[in-house]
Interface confidence: medium
Amino acid sequence: SIPWNLERITPPRYRADEYQPPDGGSLVEVYLLDTSIQSDHREIEGRVMVTDFENVPEEDGTRFHRQASKCDSHGTHLAGVVSGRDAGVAKGASMRSLRVLNCQGKGTVSGTLIGLEFIRKSQLVQPVGPLVVLLPLAGGYSRVLNAACQRLARAGVVLVTAAGNFRDDACLYSPASAPEVITVGATNAQDQPVTLGTLGTNFGRCVDLFAPGEDIIGASSDCSTCFVSQSGTSQAAAHVAGIAAMMLSAEPELTLAELRQRLIHFSAKDVINEAWFPEDQRVLTPNLVAALPPSTHGAGWQLFCRTVWSAHSGPTRMATAVARCAPDEELLSCSSFSRSGKRRGERMEAQGGKLVCRAHNAFGGEGVYAIARCCLLPQANCSVHTAPPAEASMGTRVHCHQQGHVLTGCSSHWEVEDLGTHKPPVLRPRGQPNQCVGHREASIHASCCHAPGLECKVKEHGIPAPQEQVTVACEEGWTLTGCSALPGTSHVLGAYAVDNTCVVRSRDVSTTGSTSEGAVTAVAICCRSRHLAQASQELQGSTSGSGLNDIFEAQKIEWHEHHHHHH
Amino acid sequence: QEDEDGDYEELVLALRSEEDGLAEAPEHGTTATFHRCAKDPWRLPGTYVVVLKEETHLSQSERTARRLQAQAARRGYLTKILHVFHGLLPGFLVKMSGDLLELALKLPHVDYIEEDSSVFAQ
């Protein structure tokens, strides 16, 4: 029977034993920076080219005996997971191995840097198709290793790395903490985070997604036909490297940003038991398990968005946190979150010619997070419209006044320490949905975008009684671009997007009391792009794209407004 | 790649002509920073990656490395250039005493210096 891990990453609509996508990554070269490998193993023979690159430190301990099978163990297994004949993810992918880890699985940052430089020079000397670099290693946070990864990613290389096996925040490790790298945590056959002895998979905002990483059957270096089970975030990263190779083989022109968004989009959502993670990390950790797309044709017609959390601001009164999108992504909305509820909102601002999302801590607050909604929107022209705090009791409002611009997100930022002492705004006037409304003490920021065929609608869900969490989701075919709360009172801890759902969190019910002050509305802005759909149809002909126009016609834009007990 | 070392005489001239103080301060008072691994057992003191500012050319990297060696030698310290980076990041990898960090951070073109550290199979 098929190994559990290969079944898990296979799209649900196919039986795994029937599903073998064409070319299985054959247009892609995967570089593996790891231990030495047994290149004549039956699983990988002829698929892996061993480069002459070697940069490893001396093994520790005077009694260490270098045994070939032990030296090759880690790298051989991973090469098998990526491209092995029987147990590999991308059976058509060719690989190149660089030795940066010694027989004890130890290497250096400098050796890894020189390895990455070697790859870049090889790429310049002999440009090939898409490149994937697998880094199944981790060290402490390293500015220089992250910088090198960033440079290589900006040269068009896809880097995939292990989140780390330290049962800790992945942001404390490198290259896991490099934003440009696709960082992978490990889950098991039960979709639970992997425990490894007293430790386990890393977690947190620096993890992009999880993948199978426990009891993974793959090539063993004990003999040329041997197999062995290994566990770790390296194995998980190898799965994602294989999936990336498959996707890039099907769509060689995919950018790193497009690939990352697709990996997130096609992942299984909300299957991981978050109780395994420390409480403060649960909201930051993506509940995503990697899977192959259901067809080798990408979903070019989709508007893809992902949520990017900032680092924690720290507790000082004027502390801020900044969340950034990747260079090829558009920041379509910005929200904030504070566990204590003491925050001064958030705003979108330009930094180095690009919009960023900045959240502001408040006096007595333990700190805030900024949450960016980062989307792929080709030919987009986005700007931020700001309204200063209003004098009128109706609250502050701002709309997208430029022709053809649609509202994709609302943010609000205030200077007063506690909005709770001020009355919230009254009902939003009907018939003017394309605007942001906020507290009269707050400045309001509207993200307004023009892109071919972009259309958006506002969806709200209000709860009259105080509740710790209010959610509102976008329907099938629509993508969540904006997530915010009404009203902006102090018992709201913040708002953030989880996949296609807008989540508004409030203070514990017991502390709020059930006054009308407790009413909370989650506001989602849902968008889609007709332009992307049409472009996709033209690309794919009438086979896989048929009927998209009919679907769009059937879903005429309606502005859904569900107001519940606003006082 | 071969180290474009220039004439050794250039190094000796540098030894004789440079003032006895520290290396000239980086331009516009921007201070280079030193980084090391937060996990002590993973640190590898004695080997450092000297990262130079983004637009630094290979020849400048090599010149900066030579300058460090010359100034270190005047203070009785040995330095060994293990690699000159170009292609991804400009800079060089050097074996030297940690006592030289203050001097190295003041070299022109230096952006930051990071002490080498261990990485592990996961």
Partner: antibody, heavy 121, light 107 residues
Framework: QVQLVQSGAEVKKPGASVKVSCKAS????????IHWVRQAPGQGLEWMGY????????KFNQKFKDRVTMTRDTSISTAYMELSRLRSDDTAVYYC??????????????WGQGTTVTVSS | DIVMTQSPSSLSASVGDRVTITCKAS??????VAWYQQKPGKSPKLLIY???NRYTGVPSRFSGSGSGTDFTLTISSLQPEDFATYFC?????????FGGGTKVEIK
């Protein structure tokens, strides 16, 4: 045990090139720089340069810079030194040596047995 | 290049003698000096590093001293196996130059 084993003696004509190999064993080859030193008959030792096998970075004595090439093959833990445009005064024993670095001390702790290169018409 | 001038170029001594070899650097090399022993037809062997540190396995009769420009290798009580040529080397600056050698012969 740690050792460096060099290739056998060579006899070359002036203007030719010679490539001497140095095979390392008993330690991690890429963990140490390999230096090349030569000794003309009855003379002292002359440093030619070094290679860092882990990155292929090389540094040469100016005297040899235009004629020497240092390479390595990590798969067989071997370093190579090639000297071109040979002259009769290149007749010497060529040694490879491993450099050990401790803090602010360094030295050549392991030497190859030497390769005699004779340049004669 | 830094010139290492070694003296004497040769000396004759008997077993049990105290032998001193000196090496003078043309400029300050601090303590970056190593001493090697070479027997005919053999490769050099490390004795002393960083001017005064005895290498592992080297008998205690060998000692080194000096800093700056003047360095000394001393054999406190010459043994039959010590008859060889001795070289100093500076590692302070590239190129890493050697002294001309001192041949210690049996008197």
């Amino acid at each position: 045990q740690v050792q460096l084993v060099q290739s056998g003696a060579e006899v070359k004509k002036p203007g030719a090139s010679v490539k001497v190999s140095c095979k390392a064993s008993g330690y991690t080859f890429t963990g140490y720089t390999i230096h090349w030193v030569r000794q003309a008959p009855g003379q002292g030792l002359e440093w030619m340069g070094y290679i860092n096998p882990s990155s292929t970075y090389t540094k040469f004595n100016q005297k040899f810079k235009d004629r020497v090439t240092m390479t390595r093959d990590t798969s067989i833990s071997t370093a190579y030194m090639e000297l071109s445009r040979l002259r009769s005064d290149d007749t010497a024993v060529y040694y490879c040596a491993r450099e050990r670095i401790y803090s602010n001390y360094w030295f050549f702790d392991v030497w190859g047995q030497g390769t005699t290169v004779t340049v004669s018409s | 290049d830094i010139v290492m001038t070694q003296s004497p170029s040769s000396l004759s001594a008997s077993v049990g003698d105290r032998v001193t070899i000196t090496c003078k650097a043309s400029q300050n090399v601090y303590t970056a000096v190593a001493w090697y022993q070479q027997k005919p037809g053999k490769s050099p062997k490390l004795l002393i590093y960083s001017a005064s540190n005895r290498y592992t396995g080297v008998p205690s009769r060998f000692s080194g001293s000096g800093s700056g420009t003047d360095f000394t290798l001393t054999i406190s009580s010459l043994q039959p196996e010590d008859f060889a040529t001795y070289f100093c080397q500076q590692l302070s600056s590239s190129p890493e130059t050697f002294g001309g050698g001192t041949k210690v012969e049996i008197k």
